[in-house]
């Protein structure tokens, strides 16, 4: 039994790091393998992760962590029984994939304006709480070409757009994802999408009638 593709890990910079690897043949990951991980710090205990299958020869493990600081470094040991298959290390801050935003809501009660709000996936004590920016994807269910991305580069988890920038009378869906420039993270997964019917009043077109003034001499 050998490791074909070495473990690669990403961290949510809060509580979970996910490691994936491939073996050289079909493997029952949960019965045959164990991934031991330990924070390189005083008093830190070794923890055991039981991997799950991820395709025939692929394995995935979810490493649970109490907290995280920028300097963290973990040792990783992949065991098959008494045989050490691979030894490595992992710095969560260098491989961050943020958590996906949640609770995406479209507020349509403001006249001619759509307000999209969502929740920051981190608690205030986490460094990423104040460092996330977002991308909002809006698309039409009726027209695949009607697909747009709005970049939200401010910290507030909301976006206002004029309803008139979208077609009236049809259904749209929206989803949001996050990233953090400070740790050069990858994008998070997309949030679950939310659907709404876009309807707004077309502005009343005023036809300008030109009044001819007759000047009497």
């Amino acid at each position: 039994m050998k490791v074909l593709q070495e473990p690669t890990c990403v961290s949510d910079y809060m509580s979970i790091s996910t490691c994936e690897w491939k073996m050289n043949g079909p493997t029952n990951c949960s019965t045959e393998l164990r991934l031991l991980y330990q924070l390189v710090f005083l008093l830190s205990e070794a923890h055991t992760c039981i991997p799950e299958n991820n395709g025939g020869a692929g394995c995935v493990c979810h490493l649970l962590m109490d907290d995280v600081v920028s300097a963290d470094n973990y040792t990783l040991d992949l065991w098959a029984g008494q045989q050490l298959l691979w030894k490595g290390s992992f710095k969560p801050s260098e491989h961050v994939k943020p958590r996906a935003p949640g609770n995406l809501t479209v507020h349509t009660n403001v006249s001619d304006t759509l307000l999209l709000t969502w929740s920051n996936p981190y608690p205030p004590d986490n460094y990423l709480y104040n460092h996330l920016t977002y991308a909002v994807n809006i698309w039409s269910e009726n027209d695949p070409a009607d697909f747009r991305i709005y970049n939200v580069t401010y910290l507030e988890p909301s976006l206002r757009i004029a309803a008139s920038t979208l077609k009236s009378g049809i259904s749209y869906r929206a989803r949001v994802r996050a990233w953090a420039q400070c740790y050069n993270t990858t994008w998070s997964e997309w949030s679950p999408s939310t659907k709404w019917h876009n309807s707004y009043r077309e502005p009343f077109e005023q036809h300008h009638h030109h009044h001819h003034h007759h000047h009497h001499h």
Epitope: M14, F41, L42, L43, D66, D67, A71, P123, P124, D125
Partner: antibody, heavy 116, light 112 residues
Framework: EVQLVQSGAEVKKPGATVKISCKVS????????MHWVKQAPGKGLEWMGR????????IYASKFQGKATITADTSSNTAYMELSSLRSEDTAVYHC?????????WGQGTLVTVSS | DIVMTQTPLSLSVTPGQPASISCRSS???????????LEWYLQKPGQSPQLLIY???NRFSGVPDRFSGSGSGTDFTLKISRVEAEDVGVYYC?????????FGQGTKLEIK
């Protein structure tokens, strides 16, 4: 051996500012969060705030926002807390504590007395 | 802010007898990562506090096994199976799950 050694007792006049230090040996402060805890005479423990020394990210209890400023110098492995606009109710022992992810290591405490 | 309420506020126990301290949080202290950061600290006279229990039930290294922690949700308990003279001091519960982190008001244990 892990040690968190705090600066000595201070006596200050109302309105003054004081800066307390917490010198750590036995581990690198970049590997932990450094917190400060207040204990007024004969009273209980109050969490004030914390810093991630690597990036300087701080959070404070609202009561101490504007009162306390927590900083850290990773080159000297020292955490600091500055208390401004001192009043008699700031008289207390202030403890620095490392948390990773619980308060395993405490400083000996620094008594700050505010008196005119 | 989450309020941590300890009962009783003082306790007088005969050596060799058990002791129990309750700590109730004003709301759930389950962190968004699923863990409950409920800890117990003992401050002996003239000393800085010391960690006894972390994550509700885990004894810190070097802590005698007569100390045990239990509870969930908002109700937590520290038990000392047989009190010894060296156990005197003030016991504090603490929640480190939600900012601002908060301590209980303390329970003073003395020996009869």
């Amino acid at each position: 051996e892990v040690q968190l050694v705090q600066s000595g007792a201070e006596v200050k006049k109302p309105g003054a500012t004081v800066k307390i230090s917490c010198k750590v040996s036995g581990f690198n402060i970049k590997d932990t969060y450094m917190h400060w805890v207040k204990q007024a005479p004969g009273k209980g423990l109050e969490w004030m705030g914390r810093i991630d020394p690597t990036n300087g990210y701080t959070i404070y209890a609202s009561k101490f926002q504007g009162k306390a400023t927590i900083t850290a110098d990773t080159s000297s492995n020292t955490a600091y807390m500055e208390l401004s606009s001192l009043r008699s109710e700031d008289t207390a022992v202030y403890h620095c504590v490392s948390r990773r992810p619980w308060f395993a290591y405490w400083g000996q405490g620094t008594l700050v007395t505010v008196s005119s | 802010d989450i309020v941590m309420t300890q009962t009783p506020l003082s306790l007088s126990v005969t050596p060799g007898q058990p002791a129990s301290i309750s700590c109730r949080s004003s709301q759930s202290i389950v962190h968004s990562n699923g863990n409950t950061y409920l800890e117990w600290y003992l401050q002996k006279p003239g000393q800085s506090p010391q960690l006894l229990i972390y994550k509700v039930t885990n004894r810190f290294s070097g802590v005698p096994d007569r100390f045990s922690g239990s509870g969930s949700g908002t109700d937590f308990t520290l038990k000392i199976s047989r009190v010894e003279a060296e156990d005197v001091g003030v016991y504090y519960c603490f929640q480190g799950s939600h900012v601002p982190y908060t301590f209980g008001q303390g329970t003073k244990l003395e020996i009869k």
